[in-house]
Interface confidence: medium
């Protein structure tokens, strides 16, 4: 008799999830010498232990502590790039500007990027059919709690000038409900972080407005200032060109017109 399985509103665990996590771990530790000591089997075991046999709406940050411990990593605290709703450009940027790091450039962020996972209460099975949706089902699901945990730790580690890339094409350039707005902003340490500099990425080629004047940016500035951290904002026009000009300053499209 087939066992009854909870149907959630979100997509199920990513196909070949265990193999993907293990393979990513091996690849990351090969590329990053400072993480060569990491035992990827132990990492997978700790990852699995955080959600397997647990109700997928009852996951806590504590569940991820063994994984956090194994994935402890030091990145230059003054070279951190946060992002909100503009992940691809942020990742392209750190591929070009190799001394800056997004969360997904760290081991734990790299392991989980774009993946979904959940288990079932009291069984060792991974649920490949469906997983809880943050809005429709529950917020304390394995994926959301993971990103909340690693995002908090990443923000806590930041120092000096922290940059955040924001999507100027969205109606809410700064969204209080995003991971950046709800977790990272509130976990920057005022005693370590001097300035948060927002880079507002313009969408349209001819969009020359000052998006740093946007009401949601003013809201971000207010939140940050109340935390005794200075705030700065830059308009970044033509994001394709921004990347190119950081990567290759001699390129003719950079040395010339906007």
């Amino acid at each position: 008799v087939p066992r009854w399985r909870q149907q959630w509103s979100g997509p199920g665990t990513t196909k070949r999830f265990p193999e993907t996590v293990l393979a990513r771990c091996v690849k990351y530790t090969e590329i990053h010498p400072e993480m060569r000591h990491v035992d990827c089997q132990s990492v997978w075991d700790a990852f699995k232990g955080a959600f397997i046999s647990k109700h997928p709406c009852n996951i806590t940050e504590e569940d991820y502590q063994p994984l956090m411990k194994l994935g402890t990593q030091t990145v230059p605290c003054n070279k951190i790039l946060l992002w909100s709703r503009i992940k691809d450009l942020a990742h392209q940027f750190t591929q070009v500007q190799r001394d800056m790091f997004t969360l997904e450039d760290t081991l734990l962020g790299y392991l989980a990027d774009d993946l979904t996972w959940c288990g079932e209460f009291n069984t060792s099975k991974i649920n490949y059919q469906s997983c809880p949706d943050w809005r429709k089902d529950c917020s304390n699901n394995p994926v959301s709690v993971f990103w909340k945990t690693v995002s908090r730790r990443f923000a806590e580690a930041a120092c000096d000038v922290v940059h955040v890339m924001l999507n100027g094409s969205r109606s809410k350039i700064f969204d209080k409900n995003s991971t950046f707005g709800s977790v990272e902003v509130h976990n920057l340490q005022p005693e370590k972080v001097q300035t948060l500099e927002a880079w507002v990425i313009h969408g349209g080629r001819e969009d020359s407005r000052d998006l740093c004047q946007d009401p949601t940016i003013k809201e971000l500035e207010s939140i940050i200032s109340k935390r005794n951290i200075q705030f700065s904002c830059k308009n970044i026009y033509r994001p394709d060109k921004f990347l190119q000009c950081v990567k290759n300053p001699e390129d003719s499209s950079c040395t010339s017109e906007i």
Epitope: C212, C233, K241, E250, D251, C254, T255, S256, E257
Partner: antibody
Framework: QVQLVESGGGLVQPGGSLRLSCAAS????????MSWVRQAPGKGLEWVSN????????YYADSVKGRFTISRDNSKNTLYLQMNSLRAEDTAVYYC????????????WGQGTLVTVSS | DIELTQPPSVSVAPGQTARISCSGD??????ASWYQQKPGQAPVLVIY???DRPSGIPERFSGSNSGNTATLTISGTQAEDEADYYC??????????FGGGTKLTVL
């Protein structure tokens, strides 16, 4: 080495015309945006005009719009500024500069050529 | 157009820190540059993209830019730093704008 040399300055009467040239060497002129910046005697710097590397875009300060024309000849590695309907207030040292377009700064400057508009 | 305002003059004793301000409506939303000009010479770029230094410019030159003020800081000012300094930025139309200039005197 990277060098910009301006020429064509001199004394001209109000309402007259003058064409300034700027000869570039030591870098790939055809790949760079260029600017003219001027400085009246004892005064500060004033941006005059920019031109993109393909001449497809030109920008002018309000004070010279309609009277000055910036152009370039990439085959001759030369930047030009055609100045018409000159006024006394156009009297200045005119500098040509290589500008970095995306982040908007001028990283190489010529030594300047003096334009005097007087009757 | 954005207007950039600089103090006409700043004085500093040798070895001390000189700070030259450049104020403009939301200048911090755009990138600022600084130029040094000595008498009878062409300007020289000393800071670009707010706080980057061209090669050959001493480490004592640094910059910052936030809100309505960009600042050029010269730590351990030397006699040879005596010059006029100009800030420069651009507005949303991408026109260049220069500040009025500041005469730095090393006492």
């Amino acid at each position: 080495q990277v060098q910009l040399v301006e020429s064509g300055g001199g004394l001209v009467q109000p309402g007259g015309s003058l064409r300034l040239s700027c000869a570039a060497s030591g870098f790939t002129f055809s790949s760079n945006g260029m600017s003219w910046v001027r400085q009246a005697p004892g005064k500060g710097l004033e941006w005059v005009s920019n031109i993109s590397y393909l001449s497809s875009s030109t920008y002018y300060a309000d004070s010279v719009k309609g009277r000055f024309t910036i152009s370039r000849d990439n085959s001759k590695n030369t930047l030009y500024l055609q100045m018409n309907s000159l006024r006394a207030e156009d009297t200045a040292v005119y500098y040509c500069a290589r500008f970095y377009g995306y982040f908007n700064y001028a990283d190489v400057w010529g030594q300047g050529t003096l334009v005097t508009v007087s009757s | 157009d954005i207007e950039l305002t600089q103090p006409p003059s700043v004085s500093v004793a040798p070895g001390q820190t000189a700070r030259i301000s450049c104020s403009g409506d939301n200048i911090g939303h755009y990138y600022a540059s600084w130029y040094q000009q000595k008498p009878g010479q062409a300007p020289v770029l000393v800071i670009y993209r707010d706080n980057d230094r061209p090669s050959g410019i001493p480490e004592r030159f640094s910059g910052s830019n936030s809100g309505n003020t960009a600042t050029l800081t010269i730590s351990g000012t030397q006699a040879e730093d005596e010059a006029d300094y100009y800030c420069q930025s651009y507005d949303y139309l991408h026109d260049f704008v220069f500040g009025g200039g500041t005469k730095l005197t090393v006492l």
